[in-house]
Every structure is written in structure tokens, then in C-alpha cells.
Interface confidence: medium
């Protein structure tokens, strides 16, 4: 059986909710019981079409409604003849999308105007990624390549911060993180040599 | 014309095996998969399970999964629905659906459209 | 197990839009189908493939899917449209089909 995958390059590029159809010539053969493989292990997907071409040459399809980032990988196709398995040339699916977080700020206690840092990464593709930060509704710096690291000189009460990723499918926002203000005993150092004043800020990521 | 033919209704009592079967013709009987689909009376459909082109590999719904048996004979182009032991509960009608498969032409996939009359299996005391 | 979650009925007047709805977490990854039953008949394919219109069925009918929704619409229902309706899709792995509970149309 001469096995190629028909109509799709080796690599393909699809935006994440949209749909896919990957195609699978069969010739050589009669009536061959094509299985579609993904990074190994066969794929259980009921929307498998089949076309007969002709008596020795099928058509198989694999159908995807809506890819997303879990559908990216290897695909190949395969059959079974005279006891051998003869496998296709794979297709590479890249499954495009607006950044997906791997980092997202987490919130902290600090006491007043102590520095602290949050942290942001998201990932592709598309590559690059960029970030930008908020506190609250003000944005305090960016874009950034991702990963990103804010460094914050102080905060004098509870503040919220969070972080945006862009690429060229768009943007994603992450969880808001919620920065809280550690109650400091009084008497303590903290107390005495820190003043109540506007927090200063301080974004080195930021900076030519 | 495709034509799924199935098998007279029967009764049965509890703990008796059965075997209903589903004829096609009309089409190629390697070119598509069989579904069986149950409809107790008065109540919804439920997919029970298909078997594939090749009657190499089946697949069953949860709720049947180990109750029932689907088979297929290619020489004759007949699905077949087992059970080794039946209950009261199986009371119900019975389709064979041709499913997956090829399409005519390449165009228009006209999987489970085409649908068998059904077979009433009544099981009782 | 994976469930498909439609009302159990939907009622309207002759010439008016009926809308059958058909819910489940799969649904954005999973094609939808519909099936009409009338009494004491087989089931027949309507819509296939979210919103595919299966040959033979006038064009009334109409399907669409958004998000976790499948929604089958009959624009102009008319009497002869009263049957059950039912949703079928397969579970997010791709393992096994599930119909809907159906929906029971009646045009009065």
C-alpha cells in the first residue's frame, strides 16, 4: 500500500476554535481500516470519514470541530496490511491562540512599604508574547517580553495587580492578585523608619 | 436503495440469551460502521454502540458496556446485538444505524441517516 | 457518564419559530446532531454536523452551536413538524455517542 497524507502540508497552522480536517490517501488497497494516530496513541474520534476513490484508493478523514492548545502535536495515519503496520508521513498541527498564562501574580502579605516582586509568564504560539502590567485599572508599565518580573518599591494599603499578555491572535488578562497589608507590631523597626507616602515604583523590565 | 433489514420482534423470558441481527444492502457493507440504538417504551433513544467497517473494533456506551455484545459477519453483511442473559429492564425497541464510514461521492457525509425498522424485544416472566 | 441536556418540551403556534435547545460540555469540541421522531416511526436525520441541513428536510430547519449550545430551529413551525427532537453528540474524548433526553414539539 503506497500510505500518504493527501491535501495537508507536513506543517499546518490553525487558529485555536477553528475547524480541521486532515485527509489520508490510501492507494495500493482494498477496503483499508485507516486509523488515525496522535503522538502515539490512536485516536478515538468518532467523526472519521472515509471515501472510497476508487476500489484501491480511500480517502480517510480526521475531523476536528474547534482545535485547541491539547489538539496541537503529531499526527499520521495507519493501516494494516498482511500483518505489517505501514504508517503515513506525519502532520505537524500548530494550534495558534492568544497567550495562555504558565505564571500568573499570586497574592501576597506584606507590610507597609516593604518591596516585593510578582511574577508573569504566558506562552504561544504565536511567539513573541509581550507583557503588560496593571494596578487596578492603571497601567504601570509595558509591553515586556514574556516572562516579566514587576518590582514594586511599596504599598501603604491593599492593592490589586494583575498582568496582560499579548500576541498577534490578541490578548489574555490573568488573575487578579490581591497584594494585602501585613499588620506590623507596634514598636518595631518597620513602624518607626517607614513614612506614610505614595509608593514609588520601580519597573527595570520597563527600562531602555 | 440501502436497506437495513432486522430481525421479528420476540419475547423472552429472564436470564435467556437473545441475538437480534441487522441485514444491509444496497451499499458496500465494509464502506460504513453499525450503531445499535435502544428506545425503551415511551422513553428517549440511547446509543448503545457501534462496531467498525472491518467488525474489528467496537465501542459501547457506558451503560452497556459489558451487558451487551455487538458483533458483525462481513460475508453477509449482518450486525448482530447479543445478550447472554436478559432482564426485564431490556424491554424495548432495538435500531441498527449505519454510521461513519464512506460518503457518496465524497460530498455530503450521510452517516446515521439511514435507520433500520427496529426490533421489539419484549423480556418477561 | 457525559449527558446532553434538552427541555422536555416546546410548544407553538402554527407559522411561529420553535427553538429547541441542547446542552453539554462538549459541545464546542463535538458536532451535534438532530433527529425528528414521529409517533411510532424510526428515527430521521435532520441536522448534522452543528448546522448541516441532511437532504430531504426542508429548509425551515436550521442549526446552529455556540459555545457549550446546540440549538435547532424551525422557522415557520407547522403542524405536520410535531414529533420528538433529539440532540446526539459524542463525550469530549470521542469515545462513545450520547443522544439528548428529547424534546417533545407540539404545534397547536
Known amino acids: 500500500a503506497g500510505l500518504k497524507l493527501m491535501g495537508a502540508p507536513v506543517k499546518l497552522t490553525v487558529s485555536q476554535g477553528q475547524p480541521v480536517k486532515l485527509n489520508c490517501s490510501v492507494e495500493g488497497m482494498e477496503e483499508p481500516d485507516i486509523q488515525w494516530v496522535k503522538d502515539g496513541a490512536v485516536v478515538q474520534n468518532l467523526d472519521q470519514l472515509y471515501i472510497p476513490v476508487s476500489e484501491q484508493h480511500w480517502i480517510g478523514f480526521l475531523s476536528l470541530k474547534s482545535v485547541e492548545r491539547s489538539d496541537a502535536g503529531r499526527y499520521w495515519c495507519q493501516v494494516e496490511d498482511g500483518g505489517e503496520t505501514e504508517i503515513s508521513q506525519p502532520v505537524w498541527l500548530t494550534v495558534e491562540g492568544v497567550p495562555f498564562f504558565t505564571v500568573e501574580p499570586k497574592d501576597l502579605a506584606v507590610p507597609p512599604n516593604a518591596p516585593f516582586q510578582l511574577s508573569c509568564e504566558a506562552v504561544g504560539p504565536p511567539e513573541p508574547v509581550t507583557i503588560v502590567w496593571w494596578r487596578g485599572t492603571t497601567k504601570i508599565g509595558g509591553p515586556a517580553p514574556s516572562p516579566s518580573v514587576l518590582n514594586v518599591t511599596g504599598v501603604t494599603q491593599s492593592t490589586m495587580f494583575s498582568c496582560e499578555a499579548h500576541n498577534l491572535k490578541g490578548l489574555a488578562s490573568s488573575r487578579t492578585a490581591t497584594v494585602h497589608l501585613q499588620l506590623v507590631p507596634r514598636g518595631s523597626s518597620a513602624h518607626h523608619h517607614h513614612h506614610h507616602h505614595h509608593s514609588a515604583w520601580s519597573h527595570p523590565q520597563f527600562e531602555k | 436503495e440501502v436497506q437495513l433489514v432486522q430481525s421479528g420482534a420476540d419475547v423472552k423470558k429472564p436470564g435467556a440469551s437473545l441475538t437480534i441481527s441487522c441485514q444491509a444492502s444496497?451499499?458496500?457493507?465494509?464502506?460504513?460502521?453499525i450503531s445499535w440504538v435502544r428506545q425503551k417504551p415511551g422513553k428517549g433513544l440511547e446509543w448503545m454502540g457501534q462496531?467498525?467497517?472491518?467488525?474489528?473494533?467496537?465501542m459501547y456506551g457506558p451503560s452497556f458496556q459489558g451487558h451487551v455484545t455487538i458483533s458483525a459477519d462481513r460475508s453477509t453483511a449482518t450486525a448482530y446485538l447479543q445478550w447472554r442473559s436478559l432482564e426485564a429492564s431490556d424491554t424495548a425497541m432495538y435500531y441498527c444505524?449505519?454510521?461513519?464510514?464512506?460518503?457518496?461521492?465524497?460530498?455530503?457525509?450521510?452517516?446515521?441517516?439511514?435507520w433500520g425498522p427496529g426490533t421489539l424485544v419484549t423480556v418477561s416472566s | 457518564s457525559y449527558e446532553l441536556t434538552q427541555p422536555p418540551s416546546v410548544s407553538v403556534s402554527p407559522g411561529q419559530t420553535a427553538r429547541i435547545t441542547c446542552s453539554g460540555d462538549?459541545?464546542?469540541?463535538?458536532?451535534a446532531y438532530w433527529y425528528q421522531q414521529k409517533s411510532g416511526q424510526a428515527p430521521v436525520l435532520v441536522i448534522y454536523?452543528?448546522?448541516k441541513r441532511a437532504s430531504g428536510i426542508p429548509e425551515r430547519f436550521s442549526g446552529s452551536s455556540s459555545g457549550t449550545m446546540a440549538t435547532l430551529t424551525i422557522s415557520g413551525a407547522q403542524v405536520e413538524d410535531e414529533a420528538d427532537y433529539y440532540c446526539?453528540?459524542?463525550?469530549?474524548?470521542?469515545?462513545?455517542?450520547?443522544f439528548g433526553g428529547g424534546t417533545k414539539l407540539t404545534v397547536l
Open positions: 444496497g451499499y458496500t457493507f465494509t464502506d460504513y460502521w
Open positions: 446526539y453528540s459524542q463525550e469530549r474524548k470521542g469515545n462513545y455517542f450520547v
Open positions: 454536523e452543528d448546522w
Open positions: 462538549a459541545l464546542p469540541k463535538k458536532y
Open positions: 444505524v449505519r454510521s461513519g464510514g464512506a460518503t457518496s461521492g465524497g460530498t455530503i457525509p450521510e452517516y446515521y441517516q439511514h
Open positions: 462496531i467498525n467497517r472491518h467488525a474489528s473494533n467496537t
